[in-house]
């Protein structure tokens, strides 16, 4: 998977008046990394691993960047005409990626009241707008505002892309990100299903990076896809991920089944417990 940095900023208006604060979150490699603390007007790391990425360096640069981005987005919202009464939001999501072959991608997306209305591929300078008339009107509105100085706009987006990649590379220089390996905790549980059947669930949690193989085996052979149910691989809020896989088996056949896990070149197998729960840390 590529390394990525994702900025998510939201500004609000009430009865046509743009509010002074803004909401901001930054994700690094899909993990919550920074957020903007509105009370302290500072960028704050999300969890210990985020603090470890920069070590003892301050977060002044991140604070400055987010503050500037928030200001720009408030100005954009102010130029959206025909804002109805009540609460409205303008959200900007910016993503830059560095792929294994060192190629880069960068994109930007605008949402009004949670609805996407404008996207840009920064490298190709290609803008796309959804078909709906509301999206078309909003996009025209925002693009006209952004195009007031066409050259400045072009330079602005390329600079923004370059800044994003520069920040991403700076974070990646930290061995915490590049060499980070956190083995999963694996636990297998069982629950009664229909008569004569039980559901066995294998959960892997607190692992990093995101890529993982988790599958049920019968007599050492992987079960077919259609007999297993998988959960998404999701961030667990601690800079690590979690996922699960479940299958239904006949009561009395538990000994034939194991959960197989593979992560970062290491693997383990986990039996179905005879009682209710079994928690095993994979010690590599």
């Amino acid at each position: 998977e590529p390394h990525s940095l994702r900025y998510n900023l939201t500004v609000l208006s009430w009865d046509g008046s743009v509010q002074s604060g803004f909401l901001a979150e930054v994700h690094l490699d899909g993990q919550p990394f920074l957020r903007y603390d509105r009370q302290k007007c500072r960028a704050k790391p999300q969890g210990q691993w985020a603090e470890d990425v920069l070590g003892n360096k301050t977060w002044d640069r991140e604070t400055r960047d987010l503050t500037g981005n928030g200001k720009d987005l408030r100005m954009t919202l102010a130029h959206i005409k025909d804002q109805k009464e009540g609460l409205h939001s303008l959200q900007e999501i910016r993503v830059c990626e560095i792929h294994e072959d060192n190629s880069t991608r960068s994109s930007q997306h605008f949402y009004y009241d949670g609805e996407l209305f404008l996207s840009q591929n920064v490298e190709t300078e290609e803008w796309t707008v959804p078909q709906s008339s509301r999206a078309q009107t909003l996009a025209m509105n925002v693009r006209n505002f952004l195009k007031e100085d066409a050259m400045k706009t072009k330079t602005h987006y390329h600079a923004m892309h370059a800044d994003c990649l520069q920040e991403l590379r700076r974070y990646l220089e930290s061995s915490v990100v590049l060499r980070r390996r956190v083995p999963p905790m694996v636990n297998v549980t069982r629950s009664e299903a229909s008569e004569g059947n039980i559901t066995v669930t294998c959960r892997a949690s607190s692992f990093y990076p995101r890529n993982i193989t988790l599958t049920w085996r019968q007599d050492g052979v992987s079960l077919s896809h259609d007999t297993q149910q998988w959960g998404d691989v999701l961030p667990d809020g601690n800079g690590t991920y979690q996922t699960w896989v479940a299958t239904r088996i006949c009561q009395g056949e538990e000994q034939r089944f194991t959960c197989y896990m593979e992560h970062s070149g290491n693997h383990s197998t986990h039996p179905v417990p005879s009682g209710k729960v079994l928690v095993l840390q994979s010690h590599w």
């Epitope: 992987s222 197989y260 693997h267 986990h270 039996p271």
Partner: antibody
């Protein structure tokens, strides 16, 4: 490539025990189960049991419970099958096999002839 | 235990012939059937797993079919190197059980 190399032929007296080894190479030893099978002279194949080399879990054919014990030594990537209280009808070729997680008994050892004779 | 009845127990065929070997299970085995080749002095080889899936490196002249209790191994055009004993295995229910084997010879 996956290779399973079994120990050499054994001649044992009735009542004795024998331990057959199966050394694996060409893959991560603890990834896949080991299965043991026997073939008596002029007979078909019989499944004895299997072992998960990661945590040592075993499943036996009821017929061989108390007769066969399956173990592994991770440090040498070797699976073992010990047979006790040998009788003349335990004379057979004993095979180990492993899997690729897609199929049972995917790769086989060359077999070990155990002869039980007084 | 599930009984696996394999037939014929031996057969003689000419190079280029189409050869069919069958295995019948004493109860439904839900396609969990493998076919193996046993040649004297060589390790046993997996040919087909889960009724019809060809194991990697196995020539395409080998194929498998069947469902429920009846399963078939077919060699579309017999080659001299196919001289061996063939047997089936059911992997659906413990204990795993094998067919008695079919000894294939060249006429």
């Amino acid at each position: 490539q996956v290779q399973l190399v079994q120990s050499g032929a054994e001649v044992k007296k009735p009542g004795a025990s024998v331990k057959v080894s199966c050394k694996a190479s060409g893959y991560a030893f603890t990834k896949y189960n080991f299965y043991w099978v026997r073939q008596a002279p002029g007979q078909g194949l019989e499944w004895i049991g299997y072992i998960d080399p990661y945590f040592g879990g075993t499943v036996y054919n009821q017929k061989f419970k108390g007769k066969a014990t399956l173990t592994v030594d991770k440090s040498t990537s070797t699976a073992y099958m010990e047979l006790r209280s040998l009788r003349s009808d335990d004379t057979a070729v004993y095979y180990c096999a492993t899997t690729d997680a897609y199929s049972l008994f995917t790769y086989w050892g060359q077999g070990t002839l155990v002869t039980v004779s007084s | 235990d599930i009984q696996m009845t394999q037939s014929p127990s031996s057969l003689s065929a000419s190079v280029g012939d189409r050869v069919t070997i069958t295995c019948r299970a004493s109860q439904d085995i839900s396609n969990y059937l493998n076919w193996y080749q046993q040649t004297p002095g060589k390790a046993v080889k997996l040919l087909i797993y889960y009724t019809s899936r060809l194991h990697s490196g196995v020539p395409s002249r080998f194929s498998g079919s069947g469902s429920g209790t009846d399963y078939t191994l077919t060699i579309s055009s017999l080659q001299p190197e196919d001289i061996a004993t063939y047997f089936c295995l059911q992997g659906n229910t413990l204990p795993f059980t094998f067919g008695q084997g079919t000894k294939l010879e060249i006429k």
